[in-house]
Interface confidence: low
């Protein structure tokens, strides 16, 4: 199962560095977000994330989450993410708002082991 997730990081400012994967700002934010999702979805069904993009608007993060088929639904993806907001603020200094989750209706090409 694949889910498209979008959220705002309201305490960060977007700049052109977030359009360039070679910059420290891009890489640090990518590492933090990637690790954060591993913490949020600790159950065995989580396979990883892909297609991460940063957009203007403070910083808007868009990505796709992959889970084993039948292990989670849209509501639970959103609920678990929202429950992690406080810890995201303390552990990663990321203030998260405007969370949106939707089903990706067809499998896309994602690297697997």
């Amino acid at each position: 199962s694949f889910f498209f997730l979008s959220f705002h990081i309201s305490n960060l400012q977007f700049n052109s560095s977030l359009e360039d994967p070679s910059t420290d700002y891009y890489q640090e934010l990518q590492r933090d977000i990637s690790e954060m999702f591993l913490q949020i979805y600790k159950q065995g069904g989580f396979l990883g994330l892909s297609n991460i993009k940063f957009r203007p608007g403070s910083v808007v993060v868009q990505l796709t989450l992959a889970f084993r088929e039948g292990t989670i639904n849209v509501h639970d993806v959103e609920t678990q993410f929202n429950q992690y907001k406080t810890e995201a603020a303390s552990r990663y200094n990321l203030t998260i708002s405007d969370v949106s989750v939707s089903d990706v209706p067809f499998p896309f090409s994602a690297q697997s082991g």
Partner: antibody
Framework: EVQLVQSGAEVKKPGASVKVSCKAS????????ISWVRQAPGQGLEWMGW????????NYAQKLQGRVTMTTDTSTSTAYMELRSLRSDDTAVYYC??????????????????WGQGTTVTVSS | SYELTQDPAVSVALGQTVTITCQGD??????AGWLQQKPGQAPVLVLY???SRPSGIPDRFSGSTSGNTASLTITGAQAEDEAEYFC?????????????FGGGTKLTVL
């Protein structure tokens, strides 16, 4: 307690094959992968490859492609690593380690915890 | 040859702070894992991700990452911290994914 217990030491002739086992306990075997790492005497660590205990997907180090095969038996929570056409420079301690295998997309993190106790494989004529 | 570069040896006085570094391109998109290995024993994971320690690892072990360099810091080194430390991360080239290790840093506690 999460634990990986490996099979005993092996002595093999050049050209032979060896199969090392790694029995997992204390966690849900199919929620993780197993990586295999070897360490030649007095040397550093070399990653050999990984297998998903969930679906059997494998990812082998390029230098070992064609010589190594990793398998799992979910009924006994055991992972296996077979190395063929052994050479003297395959003499090493072989370790298995639990691996979260979050490999899709951008996530390149990864860690090995815990490790098996190691299996010494000696290749000598 | 190793795709992550570590200093071969570092020493620290008992109770002092020491930092072990690990450098490599894969660290631009990956946090390092840090392993401790004592002679004749299997490696033990001491640090991974941004700030994570497995249970049982003392909080004197901490880490940081900047650009292509990861650092493991031991604040108040103890005699039992004398060991070899290896960093590792995942590396992806041409969509082929492997795990790479540093060559190891032998830490001596004086």
């Amino acid at each position: 307690e999460v634990q990986l217990v490996q099979s005993g030491a092996e002595v093999k002739k050049p050209g032979a094959s060896v199969k090392v086992s790694c029995k997992a306990s204390g966690y849900t075997f199919t929620n993780y992968g197993i990586s295999w790492v070897r360490q030649a005497p007095g040397q550093g660590l070399e990653w050999m490859g990984w297998i998903s205990a969930y679906n059997g997907n494998t990812n082998y180090a390029q230098k070992l492609q064609g010589r190594v095969t990793m398998t799992t038996d979910t009924s006994t929570s055991t992972a296996y690593m077979e190395l063929r056409s052994l050479r003297s420079d395959d003499t090493a301690v072989y370790y298995c380690a639990r691996d979260p295998h979050i490999l899709t997309g951008y996530y390149r993190g990864g860690w090995f915890d815990p490790w098996g106790q190691g299996t010494t494989v000696t290749v000598s004529s | 040859s190793y795709e992550l570069t570590q200093d071969p040896a570092v020493s620290v006085a008992l109770g002092q702070t020491v930092t072990i570094t690990c450098q490599g391109d894969s660290l631009r998109t990956s946090y390092a894992g840090w392993l401790q290995q004592k002679p004749g024993q299997a490696p033990v994971l001491v640090l991974y991700g941004k700030t994570s320690r497995p249970s049982g690892i003392p909080d004197r072990f901490s880490g940081s990452t900047s650009g292509n360099t990861a650092s493991l810091t031991i604040t108040g080194a103890q005699a039992e911290d004398e060991a070899e430390y290896f960093c590792h991360s995942r590396d992806s080239n041409d969509n082929y994914l492997e795990v790479v290790f540093g060559g190891g840093t032998k830490l001596t506690v004086l």
